[in-house]
């Protein structure tokens, strides 16, 4: 894991978009793919395991001295916690990748609480770039303005 971070807690949740679509993980040809689609109200939603980390911000970066801290997460499908959501900076996609030991920097996302209900996930390795929804897929998108709904997600405890 990233140097200087420490695990705070972990908890399962379902992940849905601003438009109430569900994020799910489907096994296809032995590999998990990420789907974003409408799920029926009665349908059981897939869950992710969120691991929350505390990360200090260097004084030079934050202007806060030692008091600046960020909350970061990495995420795994609950049905296979050895794979992580991963930011692919080559093609700006979001993938699931299996890790041998600990998640790489590309699997960490700075958590932004945008409102009491919605959060956004900023790529640790690509500041200003967030997990977003594009054409019913998760992708990496740049935040154009603060009210960008396609980067807003709801975490629901089951």
């Amino acid at each position: 894991s990233i140097q200087g971070t420490s695990l705070l807690t972990q908890s399962p949740a379902s992940l849905s978009t601003y438009n109430d679509q569900s994020v799910s993980f489907v096994l296809e040809n032995g590999c998990y793919v990420i789907n974003v689609d409408d799920s029926g109200k009665d349908q059981e939603q897939d869950q992710v395991l969120l691991r929350y980390y505390e990360s200090p911000c260097p004084a030079s970066q934050s202007g806060d001295g030692v008091d600046g801290k960020k909350l970061m997460v990495n995420m795994s499908p609950i049905k296979d916690t050895d794979i992580w959501l991963h930011a692919n900076d080559k093609d700006y996609s979001v993938e699931l990748q299996r890790g041998d030991v600990s998640p790489p920097e590309q699997a960490f996302f700075v958590l932004h609480k945008k409102s009491s209900d919605f959060v956004s996930f900023e790529c640790k390795n690509l500041p200003g770039t967030y997990i977003g929804v594009k054409d019913n897929q998760l992708a990496l998108v740049e935040e154009k303005d603060e009210s960008c709904n396609n980067i807003m997600f709801k975490l629901s405890k089951i």
Epitope: T9, D64, K70, V110, H112, K114, S116, E146, S147
Partner: antibody, heavy 122, light 107 residues
Framework: EVQLVESGGGLVQPGTSLKLSCLAS????????MTWIRQAPGKGLEWIAS????????YYPDSVKGRFTISRDDAKSTLYLQMNSLRSEDTATYYC???????????????WGQGTLVTVSS | DIQMTQSPASLSASLGETVSIECLAS??????LAWYQQKSGKSPQLLIY???RLQDGVPSRFSGSGSGTRFSLKISGMQPEDEADYFC?????????FGSGTKLEIK
């Protein structure tokens, strides 16, 4: 060093208005959710209002909703609480607080101002 | 709303004694629970966050534990400067709510 300094408290009559200010220094103000918490004399702590780090969202308990308004001026690193239609039960010390993490509300409130006393009485 | 029921309301302890304060939540939530100490005439001070994480600068005799609906604060070896009011607070769901407080005095 992180500092939060409240001002604007005082003695006012029921039904009137008051605006509290909180000047923040020692940190990057626009990265943090900010919150007002109050404490009536000899009583416990009560959450009053929170504002997102972008200023785009504000939250209140039912006890003050519609009467109090939280706002922020990032250029001045200042948090405000506009209090209208004040009642005797609003008598309390009002504290300005800062969240623990950038962009988040998780982790409690590590920084508090010294508080400003608001007394509502005729 | 999540109600936080704190007990006991008051407590007397001898110097060196270990004391515990409990907070019960009306519904379960993640570990976004904080504990504060407030000395007479002063602003509250964060002791513990994330249920068990010690805030920087807080003596290690303070510790927090619990999850779900039951949380506790322990002081291992009461010191004179620990005489204060203590409050728990949940940050998991709006409205944010506090326990009613525990007054800790030296016996």
């Amino acid at each position: 060093e992180v500092q939060l300094v409240e001002s604007g408290g005082g003695l006012v009559q029921p039904g009137t208005s008051l605006k509290l200010s909180c000047l923040a220094s020692g940190f990057t103000f626009n990265n943090y959710w900010m919150t007002w918490i109050r404490q009536a004399p000899g009583k416990g702590l009560e959450w009053i209002a929170s504002i997102t780090y972008t200023g785009g969202g504000t939250y209140y308990p039912d006890s003050v909703k519609g009467r109090f308004t939280i706002s922020r001026d990032d250029a001045k690193s200042t948090l405000y609480l506009q209090m209208n239609s004040l009642r005797s039960e609003d008598t309390a010390t009002y504290y300005c607080t800062r969240a623990n993490y950038y962009y988040n509300t998780y982790g409690g409130f590590p920084y508090w101002g010294q508080g400003t006393l608001v007394t509502v009485s005729s | 709303d999540i109600q936080m029921t704190q007990s006991p309301a008051s407590l007397s302890a001898s110097l060196g004694e270990t004391v515990s304060i409990e907070c019960l939540a009306s519904e379960g939530f993640s570990n976004d629970l904080a504990w504060y100490q407030q000395k007479s005439g002063k602003s509250p001070q964060l002791l513990i966050y994330a249920a068990s994480r010690l805030q920087d600068g807080v003596p290690s005799r303070f510790s927090g534990s619990g999850s779900g609906t039951r949380f506790s604060l322990k002081i291992s070896g009461m010191q004179p400067e620990d005489e204060a009011d203590y409050f728990c607070q949940q940050g998991s769901k709006y409205p944010l709510t506090f326990g009613s407080g525990t007054k800790l005095e030296i016996k």
